[in-house]
Interface confidence: low
């Protein structure tokens, strides 16, 4: 006959107030003849958890039934857990014995500890708005979660970030935990439609994360390029001219035109233009007149993009007499 | 480290299916549109099939009623169903990656070859 | 769909060479271009996306220009490692179409 083991397959279960926790304990044999006992503890001062044969147990059930001759099944479940309840249980096998029942062997013990689910992580960026290839500082928080072990990881776009630093609090001994994370993150120019994940992982999760998220739209701010051209064709005395505002984030632009360095004209952008990367372009278009008489026009297109320091792009018309219908190379 | 693996490769006759598999790890899969490009022996790329993370598809008329796309987020894998199979769909077809947004082909298994032939 | 024209087919050169390939776009692809390098039994490597970001842990000496329709790969100074057969691709609209690829050989 093979030697009896005694097996509780969970070193630990984490379990929540309330809720009905399960202790599972096998054996390989049904030899020696005796019953099992459940304690809470070990040495002298263990507390009897269950015995099938005396004693009253209101919260305590069987998982299988103990009365058939051929059981190896001594699980028990115990009802409306309580803080009260936590500690280690072993499951103890007895042989029969005159007058008293002796202690023959015990399994290796489950400790019971009350378990708290995580909050949903909640990740917060900063405050102003900040142009690609500059690092920006994304925080996650956790709260009320027990045990203190936790996984805390940040993603951009799917892809796993290394740069970033977490603690969890307190040191020491509490009921519940916090973890705050703070990520740094190098901004890309198309990441107007990008997304910072951070993603918390616990036991007390069964394997399915929890995950906060923040959109690099709300950091990032995209710096407008200009481009000022003359049209080639001419109506009269009048030039078409066209300011091309591209690729730029957030909406907020204003623009303003000036002849030889006189303003004459001003304009909030609008019906944008949105590029398959989530910035915007936009054209405004200025009819500049031309008489004989005016040997040098040099317009300038203007553009102060989210409350920013403006920025300005010169076009300098040569006009002649004999000019015909030529457009102008642009100057920085 | 992020890589792609295709199976499923082999010699089946003109008018047979064979289903093709890719399998994804070191990125968060589900986050991600992914590619099927095929080229055959000595010749130039193709762009065979494409299932963003939605779940939407895209074939190019060569391939459209016969090929079907479909992915298993939970098992981080890429699927590629080709029925009523011609000798010109012969080549090496490879997974690929779609990048971050810009849906660039950044990352590409190493292959698996797909023989139609009686 | 939009056809992807390179040139030149096929380019002999030599160690420390700078060279240019060139991909034309049949109608305007708003810079959804990308490049590729393939070496026999291989499969092609990203280099260049949105036709001059240079993809992670591609060295500085490729480089990608051009915008609308034209566009263009350069290798400042080419290395043994370098001659292979190079792609380029649309991904702006779907059918996504590569170039028919151009071999660069050792001269």
């Known amino acids: 006959e093979e030697e009896l083991q005694m097996i509780q397959p969970e070193k630990l279960l984490l379990v929540t107030v309330g809720k009905t926790a399960t202790l599972h304990c096998t054996v390989t044999s049904l030899l020696p003849v005796g019953p099992v006992l459940w304690f809470r503890g070990v040495g002298p001062g263990r507390e009897l958890i269950y015995n099938q044969k005396e004693g009253h147990f209101p919260r305590v059930t069987t998982v299988s039934d103990l009365t058939k001759r051929n059981n190896m099944d001594f699980s028990i479940r115990i009802s409306s857990i309580t803080p009260a309840d936590v500690g280690t249980y072993y499951c103890v096998k007895f042989r029969k014995g005159s007058p008293d029942d002796v202690e023959f062997k015990s399994g290796p013990g489950t400790e019971m500890a009350l378990g708290a689910k995580p909050s949903a992580p909640v990740v917060l960026g900063p405050a102003a708005r900040t142009t690609p290839e500059h690092t920006v500082s994304f925080t996650c928080e956790s709260h009320g979660f027990s045990p203190r072990d936790i996984t805390l990881k940040w993603f951009k776009n799917g892809n796993e970030l290394s740069d970033f630093q977490t603690n969890v609090d307190p040191t020491g001994q509490s009921v519940a935990y916090s973890i705050r994370s703070t990520a740094r993150v190098v901004l890309d120019p198309w990441d107007v439609r990008s997304q910072v994940i951070c993603e918390v992982a616990h036991v007390t999760l069964q394997g399915d994360p929890l995950r906060g998220t923040a959109n690099l739209s709300e950091a990032i701010r995209v710096p407008p390029t200009l481009e000022v051209t003359q049209q080639p064709m001419r109506v009269g005395n009048q030039v078409n001219v066209t300011c091309q505002v591209r690729k730029f984030y957030p909406q907020s632009l204003q623009l303003t035109w000036s002849e030889n360095g006189n303003v004459c004209q001003r304009e909030t952008a609008s019906t944008l233009t949105e590029n398959k990367d989530g910035t915007y372009n936009w054209t405004s278009w200025f009819l500049v007149n031309i008489s004989d008489q005016r040997d040098d026009v040099v317009l300038t297109c203007q553009v102060k993009h989210d409350g920013q320091l403006a920025v300005s792009k010169r076009l300098a018309l040569e006009v002649t007499v004999h000019q015909k219908d030529q457009s102008s190379d642009a100057t920085p | 480290e992020v890589q792609l693996v295709e199976s499923g490769g082999g010699l089946v006759q003109p008018g047979g299916s064979l289903r093709l598999s890719c399998a994804a790890s070191?990125?968060?899969?589900?986050?991600?549109?992914m590619h099927w490009v095929r080229q055959p022996t000595g010749k130039g790329l193709e762009w065979v099939s494409t299932?963003?993370?939605?779940?939407?598809?895209y074939f190019p008329g060569s391939v459209k009623g016969r090929f079907t796309i479909s992915r298993e987020n939970a098992k981080n894998s890429l699927y590629l169903q080709m029925n009523s199979l011609r000798a010109g769909d012969t080549a090496v077809y490879y997974c690929?990656?779609?990048?971050?947004?810009?849906?660039?082909?950044?990352?590409w298994g190493q292959g698996t070859m797909v023989t139609v032939s009686s | 769909d939009i056809q992807m024209t390179q040139s030149p087919s096929s380019l002999s050169a030599s160690v420390g060479d700078r060279v240019t390939i060139t991909c034309r776009a049949s109608?305007?692809?708003?810079?959804?271009l990308a490049w590729f390098q393939q070496k026999p039994g291989k499969a092609p490597k990203s280099l260049i996306y949105?036709?001059?970001s240079l993809q992670s842990g591609v060295p500085s000496k490729f480089s990608g220009s051009g915008s609308g329709t034209d566009f263009t790969l350069t290798i400042s100074s080419l290395q043994p490692e370098d001659f292979a057969t190079y792609y380029c691709q649309q991904y702006n609209t779907y059918p996504y179409t590569f170039g028919q690829g151009t071999k660069l050989e050792i001269k």
């Open positions: 109608q305007d692809i708003n810079n959804y």
């Open positions: 299932i963003g993370i939605a779940g939407d598809t």
């Open positions: 690929a990656r779609g990048g971050n947004w810009d849906d660039a082909l950044d990352i």
């Open positions: 070191g990125f968060t899969f589900s986050s991600f549109d």
């Open positions: 949105t036709a001059s």
